[in-house]
């Protein structure tokens, strides 16, 4: 299996390269504003989850799927109720994983 | 239901080895980051290994570093914890648990097995 | 390492309001986000997950239950406390290898 620190490190580069794409992410959809600090990835995919037809998330997807355990005894206490571009989702979420990243246990 | 249950506790004299062992159910074994805790005897807990999903990265505490190995075997859902040259201040209870990496956590806990070094 | 100062006791009364605190050696926090947990033990029990990152409720512990605090100053509240709320609290950082947890603070009925 691959190596947590080099899947940080990929989802890193994908969220880096789509943040520096002009053109609008996914025509410009919404996703539900979640806390990332209370949920982390997988509140993160759960947001992204909800895009279809657009390729330019779907290996952020993918990566997501692979970093989020379902069986970690987390709880988000409320339902996001603010939604916001995809494109300022994934600079939030780019922001996220570095801090992991830079002071993970690795 | 998650379930961690720890053997391999005993009485050892100074100097001596000992191998604790960790039998993990009810979650997927090998999505999660593994580690030993331990506390002595009416003292505080102590974090004191930590192991990858994958087996392939270690942690450990100094005072333990070079003495203890910790390991995994995906096959028996099993944690281990290789324990050498023990001490009088190893002793302690030794609690299995999951460690959430992200949040940096551990989220499940076993019952704990008791390790006595003592001449 | 960071060391987790914590007061050894606290004694409270049946429905009133426990604060615990913890104290790191150093800031907990990276970019907003605390790496600081709380863990419940009761007598003769492993320890248990009631708050992480500082004020997130674990699932199935609870809203009796709250935390808050950031850098280095860090509380966790109880109330009102209930008699199975008798155990020991202790506060785990997550910010630097080794992790380290705090003393324990034991709750104790007046």
């Known amino acids: 299996s691959v190596s947590l620190p080099l899947t940080l490190k990929e989802l890193i580069e994908e969220l880096s390269n789509i943040t520096q794409d002009q053109t609008p992410l996914c025509n410009g959809s919404m996703v539900w504003s979640v806390d990332l600090a209370a949920g982390g990835f997988c509140v993160a995919l759960d947001s992204l989850t909800n895009i279809s037809n657009c390729n330019a998330i779907y290996r952020t997807q993918r990566i997501l799927h692979g970093l989020c355990n379902r069986k970690a005894p987390t709880t988000v206490s409320s339902l996001p109720d603010t939604k916001i571009e995809v494109a300022h989702f994934i600079t939030k979420l780019l922001s996220y994983t570095k801090q992991l990243f830079r002071h993970g246990p690795f | 239901e998650v379930q961690l249950v720890e053997s391999g506790g005993d009485l050892v004299q100074p100097g001596r080895s000992l191998k604790l062992s960790c039998a993990a159910s009810?979650?997927?074994?090998?999505?999660?980051?593994m580690a030993w805790v331990r506390q002595a005897p009416t003292k505080g807990l102590e974090w004191v290994a930590s192991?990858?999903?994958?087996?392939?990265?270690?942690y450990y505490r100094d005072s333990v570093k070079g003495r203890f190995t910790i390991s995994r075997e995906k096959a028996k859902s099993s944690l281990y914890l290789q324990m050498d040259s023990l001490r009088s201040e190893d002793t302690a209870t030794y609690y299995c648990?999951?460690?959430?990496?992200?949040?940096?956590?551990?989220?499940?806990w076993g019952q704990g097995v008791m390790v006595t070094v003592s001449a | 390492d960071i060391v987790l100062t914590q007061s050894p006791a606290l004694a409270v009364s049946l429905g009133q309001r426990a604060t615990i605190s913890c104290r790191a050696s150093?800031?907990?926090?990276?970019?907003?986000?605390?790496?600081m947990h709380w863990y419940q033990q009761r007598p003769g029990q492993q320890p248990k997950l009631l708050i992480y990152r500082s004020s997130y409720l674990a699932s199935g512990i609870p809203a009796r239950f709250s935390g808050s605090g950031s850098g280095t100053d860090f509380t966790l509240t109880i109330y009102p406390v209930q008699a199975d709320d008798i155990a020991t609290y202790y506060c785990q950082q997550n910010r630097e290898s080794p992790w380290t947890f705090g003393g324990g603070t034991k709750l104790e009925l007046n």
């Open positions: 009810g979650f997927t074994f090998s999505d999660y980051y």
């Open positions: 192991i990858s999903n994958d087996g392939i990265s270690t």
């Open positions: 150093q800031s907990v926090t990276i970019s907003r986000y605390n790496r």
């Open positions: 648990t999951t460690w959430n990496w992200e949040f940096g956590f551990f989220d499940y």
